[in-house]
C-alpha cells in the first residue's frame, strides 16, 4: 500500500483539507470520492458540481483538495483511489465539530429569599459533540446535573444547578461556562443573583465619643439597618419600660439629653422588611458625674496619664464599663 491519507477534524463553517498522498508514484489515475462514492476529483478535474471543493495541488504524488464552508452533512469517509495494479483505496474521515448554537441561562425566579433553594438551568443547543457545562458562583465552581438530548447527530445539553442562596450571594454572578472542542477561549453566559434578606441591625453610639455615659450628659445612638429590600421601618423602643419623656426620636437616631440613672435600661432598635424583622439592643448604664479635681501640676500630661487619673477617682463599682450592645435577630 503506497496511498496515504490523514483524518481531518474541522469546525463547521471552516475549511477542511483532504490530501491523498502517493509514495513511489507511477503517474496512475488518482481520484477522490465523497461518502456517497461520487467522484469529487478525477486527477485535476472536478466533475462534481459542488464548487466548495477546490484543487490545492495535483501531481503524480499528491491530490490535495480543500472543502470550504464545511457542514455537518459533509461528515464521513472520503475515498482516495489510485489505479495501480492492483488498484488501491484509502479513506480519510472528516469529523465536523459544531459549537453550541445558543447558550441560554434560565433562573427559576428573578428574586430569591435568603435560605431558599433555587433552580438554575443552562442549555447549550445543537452542538457536536455534546458540550460540557461547568457552573460557577463568582469564582467558586459548583456541581450541576446534566442531561443530553440527541437529535440528528447533534446534541443539546441542559445542566441543572440547585442553589441555596445566602445574603452574601446578592449581586454575585452565576456563570454557565461551556467546554467544547470547537470553542476556543471562554464561552459563557451569566445571571446576577438577586437575594432578598431580612435587615441586619447595628447600633452606633455617636455621642459621647469616649463611650462613657454620665449623669447630665447627652446620649446619641444611631441605628443602621441594612437589608434587601431596604427596611422601610426603623423604630426605637425601650425594653420593659416606657421611653424617657426627654428622649427625642428622629428617624434612625435616638437622643437623650441630661441623662440620669432612671434612664438606665435596654434600648432596642427594630427594623423590618418584607423578608422579616431584626433588632439590636443597647444596654445603657448611666455613671455618676465626675468629681472635680485641680489641674495637674505637670504640664506634659499625656492622654494615658489623664485617662488614668480619671479612672482612679471614679468610685462607682462599675467604673470603666461601657454601655454594651447586643445584636439579636428575630
Amino acid at each position: 500500500q503506497n496511498l496515504f491519507t490523514k483524518d481531518v477534524t474541522v469546525i463547521e463553517g471552516e475549511v477542511a483539507t483532504i490530501s491523498c498522498q502517493v509514495n513511489k508514484s507511477d503517474d496512475s489515475v488518482i481520484q477522490l470520492l465523497n461518502p456517497n462514492r461520487q467522484t469529487i476529483y478525477f486527477r485535476d478535474f472536478r466533475p462534481l458540481k459542488d464548487s466548495r471543493f477546490q484543487l490545492l495541488n495535483f501531481s503524480s504524488s499528491e491530490l490535495k483538495v480543500s472543502l470550504t464552508n464545511v457542514s455537518i452533512s459533509d461528515e464521513g469517509r472520503y475515498f482516495c483511489q489510485l489505479y495501480t495494479d492492483p488498484p488501491q483505496e484509502s479513506y480519510t474521515t472528516i469529523t465536523v465539530l459544531v459549537p453550541p448554537r445558543n447558550l441560554m441561562i434560565d433562573i427559576q425566579r428573578d428574586t430569591a429569599v435568603e435560605g431558599e433553594e433555587i433552580e438554575v438551568n443552562c442549555t447549550a443547543m445543537a452542538s457536536k459533540p455534546a458540550t460540557t457545562i461547568r457552573w460557577f458562583k463568582g469564582n467558586t465552581e459548583l456541581k450541576g446535573k446534566s442531561e443530553v438530548e440527541e437529535w440528528s447527530d447533534m446534541y443539546t445539553v441542559t445542566s441543572q444547578l440547585m442553589l441555596k442562596v445566602h445574603k452574601e450571594d446578592d449581586g454575585v454572578p452565576v456563570i454557565c461556562q461551556v467546554e467544547h472542542p470547537a470553542v476556543t477561549g471562554n464561552l459563557q453566559t451569566q445571571r446576577y443573583l438577586e437575594v432578598q434578606y431580612k435587615p441586619q441591625v447595628h447600633i452606633q453610639m455617636t455621642y459621647p465619643l469616649q463611650g462613657l455615659t454620665r449623669e447630665g450628659d447627652a446620649l446619641e445612638l444611631t441605628c443602621e439597618a441594612i437589608g434587601k429590600p431596604q427596611p422601610v421601618m426603623v423604630t426605637w423602643v425601650r425594653v420593659d419600660d416606657e421611653m424617657p419623656q426627654h428622649a427625642v426620636l428622629s428617624g434612625p437616631n435616638l437622643f437623650i439629653n441630661n441623662l440620669n440613672k432612671t434612664d438606665n435600661g435596654t434600648y432596642r432598635c427594630e427594623a423590618s422588611n418584607i423578608v422579616g424583622k431584626a433588632h439590636s439592643d443597647y444596654m445603657l448604664y448611666v455613671y455618676d458625674p465626675p468629681t472635680t479635681i485641680p489641674p495637674p501640676t505637670t504640664t506634659t500630661t499625656t492622654t494615658t496619664t489623664t485617662t488614668t487619673t480619671i479612672l482612679t477617682i471614679i468610685t462607682d463599682s462599675r467604673a470603666g464599663e461601657e454601655g454594651s450592645i447586643r445584636a439579636v435577630d428575630h
Epitope: 489515475v29 462514492r37 461520487q38 467522484t39 478525477f42 466533475p47 458540481k49 489505479y83 495501480t84 495494479d85
Partner: antibody
C-alpha cells in the same frame, strides 16, 4: 503530437469476434482511462467501456457480457474484443482518452457486420 | 436514471444565440461535457466541467448547469457551427459513461 491511432478488421460475419487496437502516442499513459465508443450509422454515440493502465475496467451494462477490454502498458496500447457480433454491432468504433471527459479521440474505424 | 435527454434538432439564425440542453438525473451531481461532431469526423470536445473550453475552441461556446439540466450556449452562431452536439456525463456511481442522444444544429441564413 499527442494522438490516438486505431486499427482492426472492418468487415465481420455475424457471430464472429470484433477486435480493435488503439495506440497512444504521448506522455502519461498511466494517468488516464482509455475508452471505446461506437456510433451506428446515422445514430448517436454509445460508450462501450474503459480501462486504465493497471487493467481496471468498467463496461456498459448492456454490452458487458460480450465485451473484453485489455491493456498492454509496455506499448501504450489497449484493445477491444466484442464477441458474437450481429448486424446491430455495425458502427464506427472510436477509441478515446478519458479524463472523465473525452479530450482526445481516434479517427474511428468503421466495422460492418454482414453475412 | 443513467440516461441523458437532448432535443433531436435545433435551428438558429446566423449570428444569433442558441442554447442546446441536456437533462438527466446524474447532472444533479455532475457537470456535463459537450462534443461537436461534423459529418464523417470524430467528435471534438468543446466544453467540459463548469464552463471550461479546450484550447482552440472559440469563446462563443459556453456551458452552464442548473439542477438536472446542462446547457451549451453558442453566442453569435457561425455557419461552421452547424453540426451534431452530444452531451455526456457519468452515472451517479461514476463508473459508467452516458451520452445524450445528440442534437442536430442547423444554422440558417
Amino acid at each position: 503530437q499527442v494522438q490516438l491511432q486505431q486499427w482492426g478488421a472492418g468487415l465481420l460475419k455475424p457471430s464472429e469476434t470484433l477486435s480493435l487496437t488503439c495506440a497512444f502516442y504521448g506522455e502519461s499513459f498511466s494517468g488516464y482511462y482509455w475508452s471505446w465508443i461506437r456510433q451506428p450509422p446515422g445514430k448517436g454515440l454509445e460508450w462501450i467501456g474503459e480501462i486504465n493502465h493497471s487493467g481496471s475496467t468498467n463496461y456498459n451494462p448492456s454490452l458487458k457480457s460480450r465485451v473484453t477490454i485489455s491493456v498492454d502498458t509496455s506499448k501504450n496500447q489497449f484493445s477491444l474484443k466484442l464477441n458474437s457480433v450481429t448486424a446491430a454491432d455495425t458502427a464506427v468504433y472510436y477509441c478515446a482518452r478519458s479524463s472523465w471527459y473525452f479530450d482526445l479521440w481516434g479517427r474511428g474505424t468503421l466495422v460492418t457486420v454482414s453475412s | 436514471s443513467s440516461e441523458l435527454t437532448q432535443d433531436p434538432a435545433v435551428s438558429v439564425a446566423l449570428g444569433q444565440t442558441v442554447r442546446i440542453t441536456c437533462q438527466g438525473d446524474s447532472l444533479r451531481s455532475y457537470y456535463a461535457s459537450w462534443y461537436q461532431q461534423k459529418p464523417g469526423q470524430a467528435p471534438v470536445l468543446v466544453i467540459y466541467g463548469k464552463n471550461n473550453r479546450p484550447s482552440g475552441i472559440p469563446d462563443r461556446f459556453s456551458g452552464s448547469s442548473s439542477g438536472n439540466t446542462a446547457s451549451l450556449t453558442i453566442t453569435g452562431a457561425q455557419a461552421e457551427d452547424e453540426a451534431d452536439y452530444y452531451c455526456n456525463s457519468r452515472d451517479s456511481s461514476g463508473n459508467h459513461v452516458v451520452f445524450g442522444g445528440g442534437t442536430m444544429l442547423t444554422v440558417l441564413g
